[in-house]
Amino acid sequence: VQNSCDNCQPGTFCRKYNPVCKSCPPSTFSSIGGQPNCNICRVCAGYFRFKKFCSSTHNAECECIEGFHCLGPQCTRCEKDCRPGQELTKQGCKTCSLGTFNDQNGTGVCRPWTNCSLDGRSVLKTGTTEKDVVCGPPVVSFSPSTTISVTPEGGPGGHSLQVL
C-alpha cells in the first residue's frame, strides 16, 4: 500500500484521504494517473460512430456516419455532407461564391471557373455553382499570309486557300 498518489499510472484514480491507486471503473478513463476521479467515456451514438473505443487510459473518439461530416474540436457535432455547389467551412456548408463551383458531393472546395480566354477559347456554356464553364473551340485569329490547307475526307487531293 503506497502513501502517495504521485506514483499512480494512467488508468487509475487516487484519493488523498485514502492514497491508493484504484483502477478506473467500467466506462471511465484517466489519461493522467493520481487524479481524484476518472472521466466518463464518450459514447458515440446517433449520427456518431466509434472511430476509437474507450480504454482505461484514453477516451473514445467519434466520427460521423456516412453522409455526415464532423464539426468542432474532437468532432463534437455532425452535419449533413455538403451538396454540389457548396463547400465546407468552419461555419458549416456554404454556397460557392459567384465565379466558383464545386461539382463534388460531400467533399471538395469551391474552385474558380476556367478562364476560357486564357486558352484563346470562347465560353460555350456559362458556369454555375455546381458546374464549371464549358469553353468553345479556339477562336481563330486570321493574319495575312496564312495558308490554310483543307483536305477533304477520303481524298488525297487538297485545295490551297490563300488569305490576303
Epitope: S27, T28, P36, N37
Partner: antibody, heavy 124, light 106 residues
C-alpha cells in the same frame, strides 16, 4: 488530519426547517461527489441525497424530493443539506460521506469516507 | 428498487472463528456491491468494494466474494474488535443497503 465534520443537527418540530453543514478539512472536498446518508435510531442505512463534484448534478431519494436540497460551496469546502417540511420519519443520524466510485458518476456510489454524523430529532 | 437480504440478522461467534456473512440482491448487480462495518456509536467504515476489493487500511482477515445476486463477507479469524454490525450495499441501480448483520462474541 483529514476529516469531515457535520453540524446543525438538533431537535426540531414537524413541519419546520433545518440546515445541516458538512465541513471538509485536510483535503479538497470539491474534488469529490458527496452524499448524505441517514440512519434512524437502531435501524439501517439510507441514502438521502447526492451532489456531483462540481455541484451541477443532484439526486434525491423519493421520500425527500421537493423537501430537501443538497448544495455545496467549494470555496468554503462545505456541503449543505437544507431540510424543509420535516416529518417524524426524518428523525435520524445524518452522515456526510464521499463517493468512492471514482467515475464522476451519478449512478454508482459507494461511500469510502464518512463524518461522525449529526443527530436530527423531529418531534413536537 | 433492488431489495437486499442479509443473513443471518444476528450471529454469535468466538474469537478465532471463521465467520461468514451473506447478502442477497433481488436482481443481478454484477460486482457492484460494498460491505461496511459499523461499531457501536460510530460511523460506518468501508471494508470491501466491487464485491471483492479490500479497502486500504482494512485488515487482510476480511475478504469479499460473489457476483450477480449472492455475496459473502468472510472474516478468517474473528478478533474482539470485529464485534459490530455489518451492512452490504448495492450500487448497480440506485443505492440500497441491507438491514445488517449484528455480529457478537459468544
Amino acid at each position: 488530519e483529514m476529516q469531515l465534520v457535520e453540524s446543525g443537527g438538533g431537535l426540531v418540530q414537524p413541519g419546520r426547517s433545518m440546515k445541516l453543514s458538512c465541513a471538509g478539512s485536510g483535503f479538497t472536498l470539491s474534488d469529490y461527489g458527496v452524499a448524505w446518508v441517514r440512519q434512524a435510531p437502531k435501524k439501517g442505512l439510507e441514502w438521502v441525497a447526492y451532489i456531483s463534484y462540481a455541484g451541477g448534478t443532484t439526486y434525491y431519494r423519493e421520500s425527500v424530493k421537493g423537501r430537501f436540497t443538497i448544495s455545496r460551496d467549494n470555496a468554503k469546502s462545505t456541503l449543505y443539506l437544507q431540510m424543509d417540511s420535516l416529518r417524524s420519519e426524518d428523525t435520524a443520524t445524518y452522515y456526510c460521506t464521499i463517493d468512492g466510485y471514482g467515475g464522476y458518476s451519478g449512478s454508482h456510489w459507494y461511500f469510502d469516507f464518512w463524518g461522525p454524523g449529526t443527530m436530527v430529532t423531529v418531534s413536537s | 428498487d433492488i431489495q437486499m437480504t442479509q443473513s443471518p440478522s444476528l450471529l454469535s461467534a468466538s474469537v478465532g472463528d471463521r465467520v461468514t456473512l451473506n447478502c442477497r440482491t433481488s436482481q443481478n448487480v454484477y460486482k457492484n456491491l460494498a460491505w461496511y462495518q459499523q461499531q457501536l456509536g460510530e460511523a460506518p467504515k468501508l471494508l470491501i468494494y466491487n464485491a471483492n476489493s479490500l479497502q486500504a487500511g482494512i485488515p487482510s482477515r476480511f475478504s469479499g466474494s460473489g457476483s450477480g445476486t449472492d455475496f459473502t463477507l468472510t472474516i478468517s479469524s474473528l478478533q474482539p474488535e470485529d464485534v459490530a454490525t455489518y451492512f452490504c450495499q448495492q450500487y448497480y441501480s440506485g443505492n440500497t443497503f441491507g438491514a445488517g448483520t449484528n455480529l457478537e462474541l459468544k
